[in-house]
Interface confidence: medium
């Protein structure tokens, strides 16, 4: 062929026409190609009707071709493998009537803000769907209903806040979930089912530790050698489980599946019996795990500790009260978010160490309705207001710009931003031991604060409070089994991880598969 | 053509900062991810920070927290906010472009030279 | 972090003459998915900035003469210069961009003997 390269191999006839300025399908290929490379093209557009005429076509590469937009027509009847993986897409085309056979769909690495309900509608023998580092805070529930033999699902390195709680129901043969490096707080009570998982990456997420947090803290405790971190090049034959990574973002990296939930409602007359599936409460300590019931006590002043407030939240608060237009590294005290508490337990973590520090107290009476009032928003001490600019990209950063807290793995892909701020060039420096500044009294809005960061609201908006800390040293401390660190961080969100570094989506797909 | 003109070098104390940018023309800026390439005076090459097309920063531990990449699409620039400098940092650097996040760099500037030096 | 190793660090050519040049990776740079081997070529000629010679291993850049080839997969990778000429003079550096942080070789510095 006079562009692209062809070759035959086996039964295959692949055709190459990769990196050759192609803005579109190059005439006369062979009309029995079964593999079609365009990769790194200036494809920009791109009708999948211009391959009918090949309907041997099992595997269209389009990755890297500035695609903006993916035309779905005609029929591509044994098409098994598409990969659309580093282009510009920001939604996702429906394939289902296209792609009738469609077995792997990668769509890493583009601009996905959201997936519509029907996205998959119609990819009945879909097996792997790679979603990792686009920009989704939410997914549709039923969104993997039509995908019943999934195996493989990533969403890593994305703004996800939260799960349908349903997210996985019929998903019987899914063996890995890629979880890992997303804003995830908590996890839905009955999330991971029945049935067994394999191989669960779910660290790099900020998971609040409180009485919400039992569901999924008893699931890593029952399915704690199916808990990995990943690690580029390594065979999972070799791959040590870690459910120590999975950590709790307001208590200094205290694992999640050691959490005590002292305070928590439990089986009884006091509690909830509906809150964590019927998972009694513990109380671990060391190697003993001792089943407890407690009275629940709602405190009328807020334990301020080593690591900030502890509080939950609602989940409707965070859409509501969440800015949609600020960039994971960017940081904004135009409002100080905050969220209205469900209920507060009096707890304390077990640590080596705790003690109560000396920040300021935040004194919050609750009143008896607590989701009626809005809370008030309050501007945060010692940090520079940022102007925002209609200019939809990254800022500009400031000369000297407070640190930035930093995730123990790599970043994910940041939430869209249509309105960023520019800081200004020298923004007033915050002490570095700021005078205590009280928090006034809300009627039942407790301002969320976290020592090292900020507010708790997952990779949103920042205020420097007392103690700049880095969390990758908190990190390094409570991992040692981890051969070594993770060594590519990003602010805020870390993502060493290319598309590459998922298990099975790429260098590795070989090694995960079941042995 | 292609071109990528690094500026905002210099003398810098440690513990000072300093902010290199990096002018693209010849491409579309926003479709490319970009990145910042470090070599210390008679050695080797040192990846330094990226920036996907979508603007998430990527850093190596060596500059982590000290160092931030952005990126101004609407003014075909990129940059490199460089806080706590140390005398370690003094480098060339150099912004180079790559398709995506995860490819070569195809395209190199001039670079710009930083001293820290007290 | 994959480590990368290039030998020799020097290496006197006639021109001409063949030259190769070797890279190793600490770990596999091969791609399962796509068959490629993630691995770049760079050639940093005196004064001037590195410019891309070889992506994927073996893949030439355009513009660049096709003297130069690569080759390899895995962990072993090799640079060859057909017939070396004058201007080819440099410091030629390998760069993994299979698993971040990316990585370079230290650089085998070719010069006209």
């Known amino acids: 062929h006079p562009i692209c390269e062809v070759s035959k191999v086996a039964s295959h006839l692949e055709v190459n026409c990769d990196k050759r300025n192609l803005t579109a399908l190059p005439p006369d290929l062979p009309k029995d190609t079964t593999i079609l490379h365009l990769s790194e093209n200036l494809l920009y557009t791109f009708s999948l009707a211009t391959l009918m005429p090949y309907t041997r076509l099992t595997q269209l590469n389009l990755d890297r071709c500035e695609l903006t937009k993916l035309q779905v027509d005609g029929t591509l009847p044994v098409l098994g493998t598409l990969d659309l993986s580093h282009n510009q897409l920001q939604s996702l085309p429906l394939l289902g009537q296209t792609l009738p056979a469609l077995t792997v769909l990668d769509v890493s690495f583009n601009r996905l803000t959201s997936l519509p309900l029907g996205a998959l509608r119609g990819l009945g023998e879909l097996q792997e769907l790679y979603l990792k580092g686009n920009e989704l805070k939410t997914l549709p529930p039923g969104l993997l209903t039509p995908t019943p033999k999934l195996e493989k699902l990533s969403l890593a390195n994305n703004n996800l806040t939260e799960l349908p709680a349903g997210l996985l129901n019929g998903l019987e043969n899914l063996d890995t979930l890629l979880l890992q490096e997303n804003s995830l707080y908590t996890i839905p009570k009955g999330f991971f089912g029945s049935h067994l998982l394999p191989f669960a990456f779910l660290h790099g997420n900020p998971w609040l530790c409180n009485c919400e947090i039992l569901y999924f803290r008893r699931w890593l405790q029952d399915n704690a050698e199916n808990v990995y971190v990943w690690k580029q090049g390594v065979d999972v034959k070799a791959m040590t489980s870690n459910v120590a990574s999975v950590q709790c973002d307001n208590s200094d990296k205290f694992p999640v599946y050691k959490y005590p939930g002292k305070g928590c409602p439990t089986l009884g007359d006091e509690g909830d019996t509906d809150l964590y599936d019927y998972y009694p409460e513990e109380d671990t300590e060391g190697d003993k795990v001792r089943a407890t019931r407690t009275v629940v006590k709602f405190p009328t002043k807020a334990h301020t500790t080593p690591w900030g407030l502890f509080y939950s939240w609602s989940t409707a608060s965070l859409d509501s009260q969440m800015p949609s237009s600020l960039h994971p590294t960017q940081e904004s005290t135009k409002e100080q978010t905050t969220f209205p508490p469900r209920w507060t337990p009096n707890f304390t973590l077990h640590m080596e160490s705790i003690t109560f520090s000396k920040t300021p107290k935040s004194t919050t009476e609750p009143t008896p309705s607590p989701t009626t009032s809005e809370p008030v928003p309050e501007p945060a001490p010692n940090m520079t207001t940022l102007e925002p600019t209609p200019s939809p990209t990254t800022p500009e950063p400031t000369s000297e710009p407070a640190p930035s807290p930093t995730t123990p793995e790599p970043t994910s892909e940041p939430a869209p931003s249509p309105t960023t701020p520019e800081p200004t060039s020298e923004p007033a420096p915050s002490p570095t031991t700021p005078e205590p500044t009280p928090i006034p009294t809300i009627a039942t809005s407790p301002t969320i604060l976290v020592s090292a960061t900020s507010l708790i609201t997952p990779k949103s908006t920042f205020l420097t409070t007392t103690k700049p800390v880095s969390l990758l040293e908190s990190t390094k401390k409570t991992i040692p089994e981890l051969d070594q660190p993770p060594k590519l961080r990003g602010v805020l969100q870390g993502h060493l991880e290319s598309s590459r570094n998922d298990p099975f989506l790429h260098p590795d797909f070989c090694c995960l598969l079941p042995l | 053509q292609v071109q990528l003109v690094e500026s905002g070098g210099g003398v810098v104390q440690p513990g000072r900062s300093l902010r290199l940018s990096c002018a693209a023309s010849?491409?579309?800026?926003?479709?490319?991810?970009m990145s910042w390439v470090r070599q210390a005076p008679g050695k080797g090459l040192e990846w330094v920070a990226s920036?996907?097309?979508?603007?998430?920063?990527y850093y190596p531990d060596s500059v982590l927290g000290r160092f931030t990449i952005s990126r101004d699409n609407s003014k075909n620039t990129l940059y490199l906010q460089m806080n706590s400098l140390r005398a370690e940092d003094t480098a060339v650097y150099y912004c180079a472009r790559s398709r995506g996040y995860e490819d070569y760099f195809d395209y190199w500037g001039q670079g710009t030279l930083v001293t820290v030096s007290s | 972090d994959i480590v990368m190793t290039q030998s020799p660090l020097s290496l006197p050519v006639t021109p001409g003459e063949p030259a190769s040049i070797s890279c190793k990776s600490s770990q596999s740079l091969l791609n399962s998915r796509n068959q490629k081997n993630y691995l770049a070529w760079y050639l940093q000629k005196p004064g001037q900035s590195p410019q891309l010679l070889i992506y994927f291993t073996s893949t030439r850049e355009s513009g660049v003469p096709d003297r130069f080839s690569g080759s390899g997969s895995g962990t072993d990778f090799t640079l060859k210069i057909s017939r070396v000429e004058a201007e080819d003079v440099g410091v030629y550096y390998c760069q993994q961009h299979y698993s971040s942080p990316w990585t370079f070789g230290q650089g085998t510095k070719v010069e006209i003997k």
């Open positions: 920036i996907t097309s979508a603007g998430t920063p």
């Open positions: 010849g491409f579309t800026f926003s479709s490319f991810a």
